[in-house]
């Protein structure tokens, strides 16, 4: 079952996905695609990273976090109802069938007619430096093995009512999180 995330038309949608690099610079390729994760790769790729950089992206899709430290959460800019659906975050761990696949369901709600302050704000505007930490959860080993030890955490909703920017680090445990050891 997919984890569900919500956004309003015209907002930026946020789909969290994380991993912890085994060592600084030891990055793992990641792809984001529209539609559930297939057996291999991502279907309808909207963004891709390699061992070094973001090497492919399409309009409105970008990484606001620091992908070099494992924050590969996807931001979709100025969403419309057509952006609703399943998105796949695939962490392409070396080795046969080692990839970790996360299906995240994005539900787009119509914008409120009356322009009024809303508590469900664009996270980027509210916390422009959030989600740049190296992660929470156990991780000890320093090299990629052929069968990595992986911890998964999936929490059903992203906190919508952040009262304090210090809670931003807690969001690191929301969504899809793995460690690579």
């Amino acid at each position: 079952s997919e984890v569900e995330y919500r956004a309003e038309v015209g907002q930026n949608a946020y789909l969290p996905c994380f991993y912890t690099p085994a060592a600084p610079g030891n990055l793992v390729p990641v792809c984001w695609g529209k539609g559930a994760c297939p057996v291999f790769e991502c279907g309808n790729v909207v963004l891709r990273t390699d061992e070094r950089d973001v090497n492919y992206w399409t309009s409105r899709y970008w990484l606001n976090g620091d992908f070099r430290k494992g924050d590969v959460s996807l931001t979709i800019e100025n969403v419309t109802l057509a952006d609703s659906g399943i998105y796949c975050c695939r962490i392409q761990i070396p080795g046969i069938m080692n990839d970790e696949k996360f299906n995240l369901k994005l539900v787009i709600k119509p914008a409120k007619v009356t322009p009024a302050p809303t508590r469900q704000r664009d996270f980027t505007a509210a916390f422009p430096r959030m989600l740049t930490t190296r992660g929470h959860g156990p991780a000890e080993t320093q090299t990629l093995g052929s069968l990595p030890d992986i911890n998964l955490t999936q929490i059903s909703t992203l906190a919508n009512e952040l009262r304090d920017s210090r809670l931003a680090n807690d969001l690191r445990d929301s969504g899809a999180t793995i460690r690579i050891g």
Epitope: A23, L63, R68, T132, G135, A139, Q142, N169
Partner: antibody, heavy 125, light 108 residues
Framework: EVQLQQSGPVLVKPGASVKMSCKVS????????MNWVKQSHGKSLEWIGV????????TYNQKFKGKATLTVDKSSSTAYMELSSLTSEDSAVYYC??????????????????WGQGTSVTVSS | EIVLTQSPATLSVTPGDSVSLSCRAS??????LHWYQQKSHDSPRLLIK???QSISGIPSRFSGSGSGTDFTLSINSVETEDFGIYFC??????????FGGGTKLEIK
Amino acid sequence: EVQLQQSGPVLVKPGASVKMSCKVSEYTFTDYYMNWVKQSHGKSLEWIGVINPYNGGVTYNQKFKGKATLTVDKSSSTAYMELSSLTSEDSAVYYCARDADFHGNSYVGYAMDYWGQGTSVTVSS
Amino acid sequence: EIVLTQSPATLSVTPGDSVSLSCRASQSISNDLHWYQQKSHDSPRLLIKYASQSISGIPSRFSGSGSGTDFTLSINSVETEDFGIYFCQQSHSWPQYTFGGGTKLEIK
């Protein structure tokens, strides 16, 4: 204010080892990578390696592999560097330096925004 | 390995002069170039990051420019406290960093 407090100067004999520390304060230790940099007397700076304090993952400059070992103690927010099989070539000032926050997806690397005061190592018989 | 070459090695100036320090990379490093100042017996201090981005607390007389392989640190109207050694550092090959050899700024 962010501070990186390094251990004091040391005088050691050739062949010995030395372990120096870098204790941080006023920021979350596990949220920033920690670099170590060597400065030989009157010379430029050499990057030794970087450690992720969160999981202990280390990446070294090839030149310092086998010479330097980087570790951390999360409970005390302290980074350590041990230098082994010391020779006169290892006489230098060693700095710990924090990786700055990321700047944006179009940039690959980081600057070093806070530095320790340095630990002077003298190797002499 | 990306090699950074700084020039001149030494620059003798009078307070009030405006100066430019050069840092040249052996290959294109985009904007991943940072400048540091080191005064005698002190630690390096970050002056400019990503070629031209200013740092909080650093006087506005320091500015940086350049992209690709050629970079410049400019000091508008040098003050006595500015004398010391200036290093450039590239982070394009992150996490493998390299530094330039330094430019010594001294009083004429």
